[in-house]
């Protein structure tokens, strides 16, 4: 087929999809034109496995990523629950436009959020001390709408300060008790989430939380002192 005479713009370069926790963000490098005073705009389209291409606009996906001057499209900008369903096979494509001119489409490799996501550490970690125990509470890296499809399990990496690291888990609960610790000792810990997607038997190991340390309480039978 003869080349499209209107397809004379350079295509956006180095598009990247960021899938971090619930975020779904497409970004790219700007198309620079030295001989134009008008801004280059961009259009993003998406498709599912057997669907046609849809323009990424408010009606279709809840965000406007057509005729935009920005060099990113955040599909989850409206809310963390917005964006593409996490178990859908999604393909994105992108082009630059200037008046009647446009670039060729740049098509990204397909993704599934659960398959490709980078899982961050558990958040809001709070620890309550006991005598020879630490109760650890935290929230999930992100919310999963249907926990029969995918779910988190958790591991705690812990060690007596200056000692050998141990791992406890997996747990399904957002509350974990480390028992059989020594009283009046300092223990350090990190919590880690692992995302399991039942459908494809896929699991994504998450980042460790920052190290934090906690003193267990003295034996409860001893008299309390300042």
């Amino acid at each position: 087929a003869p080349p499209d005479p209107l397809s004379q713009l350079p295509a956006p370069q180095h598009p990247k999809i960021r899938l971090y926790n619930a975020e779904q963000v497409l970004s790219w490098e700007p198309v620079a034109l030295s001989n134009s005073t008008r801004p280059v705009v961009y259009q993003v389209q998406f498709k599912y496995t057997d669907s046609k291409w849809f323009t990424a606009d408010i009606m279709s996906i809840g965000v406007n990523c057509t005729q935009i001057t920005a060099t990113e499209c955040d599909f989850t900008a409206a809310s963390p629950s917005a964006g593409f369903p996490m178990d859908f096979n999604v393909t994105l494509r992108l082009r630059a436009e200037l008046g009647a001119l446009h670039s060729a489409w740049v098509t990204m490799p397909w993704f599934q959020h659960y398959r490709n996501v980078t899982v961050g550490p558990p958040e809001n970690i709070e620890v309550t001390p006991g005598e020879g125990s630490l109760i650890i509470r935290f929230s999930s890296p992100f919310d999963i709408a249907d926990t029969s499809t995918a779910f988190f399990c958790y591991y705690v990496h812990y060690w007596e300060k200056g000692g050998i690291q141990q791992v406890k888990g997996p747990f399904r609960s957002n509350s974990i008790s480390l028992d059989n610790l020594k009283p009046s000792r300092v223990y350090c810990l990190q919590v880690q989430a692992q995302l399991l997607w039942n459908k494809s038997n896929i699991f994504r190991v998450g980042h460790l939380s920052n190290i934090s340390c906690y003193e267990t309480m003295a034996d409860a039978s001893t008299e309390l002192q300042q």
Epitope: C188, N210, I211, C213, E215
Partner: nanobody
Framework: QVQLQQFGGGLVQPGGSLTLSCAAS????????MGWYRQAPGKRRELVAS???????TYADSVKGRFTISRDNAKNTVYLQMNALKPEDTAVYYC?????????????????WGQGTLVTVSS
């Protein structure tokens, strides 16, 4: 150094009410949680109530529905409102704060205690 100063306590009749308060001061980077423990003569120390920064409360079964813990984070102060007091609530009540002083390589929470205040429930 971290200091916990307790206020309140005393003698109260069964069914009566008391409020304890506890203010933390000193080199405090973070406190989480703050709470109250008690120790009756010849008994082991027990948790009465605890409150985390995210608002997660823990109560001993024996005080649920009667005691309420609250906290003023800006003042590093924790309160214990005790209603419908019973003779078995008689004990020395200790304020507890889990404090990170910011003086370690990583956040490190250590146990600090108030001086204790006697609550006596008797007719």
């Amino acid at each position: 150094q971290v200091q916990l100063q307790q206020f309140g306590g005393g003698l109260v009749q069964p069914g009566g009410s008391l409020t304890l308060s506890c203010a933390a001061s000193g080199s405090i980077f973070s406190i989480n949680p703050m709470g109250w423990y008690r120790q009756a003569p010849g008994k082991r120390r027990e948790l009465v109530a605890s409150l985390t920064n995210r608002g997660i409360t823990t109560y001993a079964d024996s005080v649920k529905g009667r005691f309420t813990i609250s906290r003023d984070n800006a003042k590093n102060t924790v309160y214990l409102q005790m209603n419908a007091l019973k003779p078995e609530d008689t004990a020395v009540y200790y304020c507890h704060a889990y404090v990170d002083t910011g003086s370690h390589e990583y956040p490190q929470y250590e146990n600090y205690w108030g001086q204790g205040t006697l609550v006596t429930v008797s007719s």
